[in-house]
């Protein structure tokens, strides 16, 4: 077959709009959230999804932008500054910090395109790296050398 | 910024190839790796990146597929079955499990496109959900009701 970059069919068939549509389905983390009696509290549950059973529990915050692809992103927000004790599930242990794990995700923003003489020629996609927080992790504090 | 090649402009402008090119820069998690004397061992370091300071430490494994966008994905692999003690950083605490946090990421596969009468018309992008493991999290084991 012919050399691959031609990603979408032959010239004149613009399916990038289709590509845009595909990507807008929100894809939150896999495990569905179940009700949590204290959804904003600093405690580690013994049931429910991973983010509520973690000893560095977190909640998800929706970040929606209709001019961005994907439109829906989710940011983790830590519910505790320190890690929760494995024994009690509620008391904090100052020997451990609850830290956000970040990721630079590639996103695309929809911007007006300008053709010749500044005429509006549909939309362009502008690629950006967008920082999202994935989860909260219980870590040992850094010991500065 | 310079115009990002009209991805979904007027009919007849096929720049989806350009969109493909943008997206291939590998974008692993933010914090760069630092030396780890026992890179594959079950211990929580007091320095280095988040994944080695975590009490549920993990490493990243590269998953490369030249027919997928993005081509490079990273899977977390837990280095311990249980969480590491905050006190020692090395002994495991059986009261906590080190569990993978999964995410269904939207990816695109390039597939031959077929035009009228089944003729090959370049490549199309097929949207898929692809399961990646983002991190290992220290959780309290589920108590079955």
């Amino acid at each position: 077959y012919s050399h691959w970059p031609s990603c979408c069919p032959s010239k004149g068939q613009d399916t990038s709009e289709e590509l845009l549509r595909w990507s807008t389905v929100p894809v939150p983390p896999l495990e569905p959230a179940r009700p949590n009696r204290h959804p904003e509290s600093c405690r580690a549950s013994e049931d429910g999804p991973l983010n509520s059973r973690a000893i560095s529990p977190w909640r998800y915050e929706l970040d929606r932008d209709l001019n961005r692809l994907p439109q829906d992103l989710y940011h983790a927000r830590c519910l505790c500054p320190h890690c929760v004790s494995l024994q009690t599930g509620s008391h904090m242990d100052p020997r451990g910090n609850s830290e956000l794990l970040y990721h630079n995700q590639t996103v695309f923003y929809r911007r007006p395109c300008h053709g010749e003489k500044g005429t509006h020629k549909g939309y362009c996609l502008e690629r950006r790296l967008y920082r999202v927080s994935l989860a909260c992790v219980c870590v040992r504090p850094r010991v500065m050398g | 910024y310079s115009h990002w090649p009209s991805c979904c402009p007027s009919k007849g402008q096929d720049t989806s190839e350009e969109l493909l090119r943008w997206s291939t820069v590998p974008v692993p998690p933010l914090e760069p790796a630092r030396p780890n004397r026992h890179p594959e061992s079950c211990r929580a370091s007091e320095d280095g990146p988040l994944n080695s300071r975590a009490i549920s430490p993990w490493r990243y494994e590269l998953d490369r597929d030249l027919n997928r966008l993005p081509q490079d994905l990273y899977h977390a692999r837990c280095l311990c079955p249980h969480c590491v003690s905050l006190q020692t950083g090395s002994h495991m605490d059986p009261r906590g499990n080190s569990e993978l946090l999964y995410h269904n990421q939207t990816v695109f596969y390039r597939r031959p496109c077929h035009g009228e009468k089944g003729t090959h018309k370049g490549y199309c992008l097929e949207r898929r959900l692809y399961r990646v493991s983002l991190a290992c999290v220290c959780v309290r084991p589920r108590v079955m009701g």
Epitope: - | W22, P29, E31, R59, L62, L69
Partner: antibody, heavy 121, light 107 residues
Framework: EVQLVESGAEVKKPGASVKVSCKAS????????MNWVRQAPGQRLEWMGL????????SYNQNFKGRVTLTVDTSASTAYLELNSLRSEDTGVYYC???????????????WGQGTLVTVS | DIQMTQSPSSLSASVGDRVTITCSAS??????LNWYQQKPGKVPKLLIY???SLHSGVPSRFSGSGSGTDFTLTISSLQPEDVATYYC?????????FGQGTKLEIK
Amino acid sequence: EVQLVESGAEVKKPGASVKVSCKASGYSFSGYTMNWVRQAPGQRLEWMGLINPYNGGTSYNQNFKGRVTLTVDTSASTAYLELNSLRSEDTGVYYCAREDFDSWTYFAMDYWGQGTLVTVS
Amino acid sequence: DIQMTQSPSSLSASVGDRVTITCSASQGIHWNLNWYQQKPGKVPKLLIYYTSSLHSGVPSRFSGSGSGTDFTLTISSLQPEDVATYYCQQFNSFPYTFGQGTKLEIK
């Protein structure tokens, strides 16, 4: 100018381990993956694995049966190859090689270290 | 693993000759193939990437072609400095694999 400088020759006994270093300069170390390639005397080049210095992400050649560990020290722009349980057939020159890429087209080893001779006897 | 087989294993040609080296993959690899040149006692150098693209600084007498399973490296007019062993390498899937090499000498 891009340079990869490897550590000096090593002589090891069977069963021992060896650790080879590769110091990079002239480019952003975290921006490119680093490959390791072995060349035994009179043999073809053999890919051992690669590591992304940005996050320590690795891919290994399973033919080495878990004997290879790749690590990096980003603060020193240095990559390391450790090979355990050495045997005589591990004798050869070990190269680090930077991997260049151009989105959706290629991955290629565009700069190579001078090689480190490891002798197992 | 994908097996890469080069032919011939060695060849001798005269200065000015057109030289062709072939590389065959055990399964289709699209255009995901590179060629390296290793001069005696030296480090391998990237010659051609992605089947046919010349690496910077490589003379235009070198060219590459092919797709799928069969690939060719051509030197249009052999020069004395081209004496080396040439290796093909697939990057279609891990583990990356190399051909056994083709040793090129001057008659």
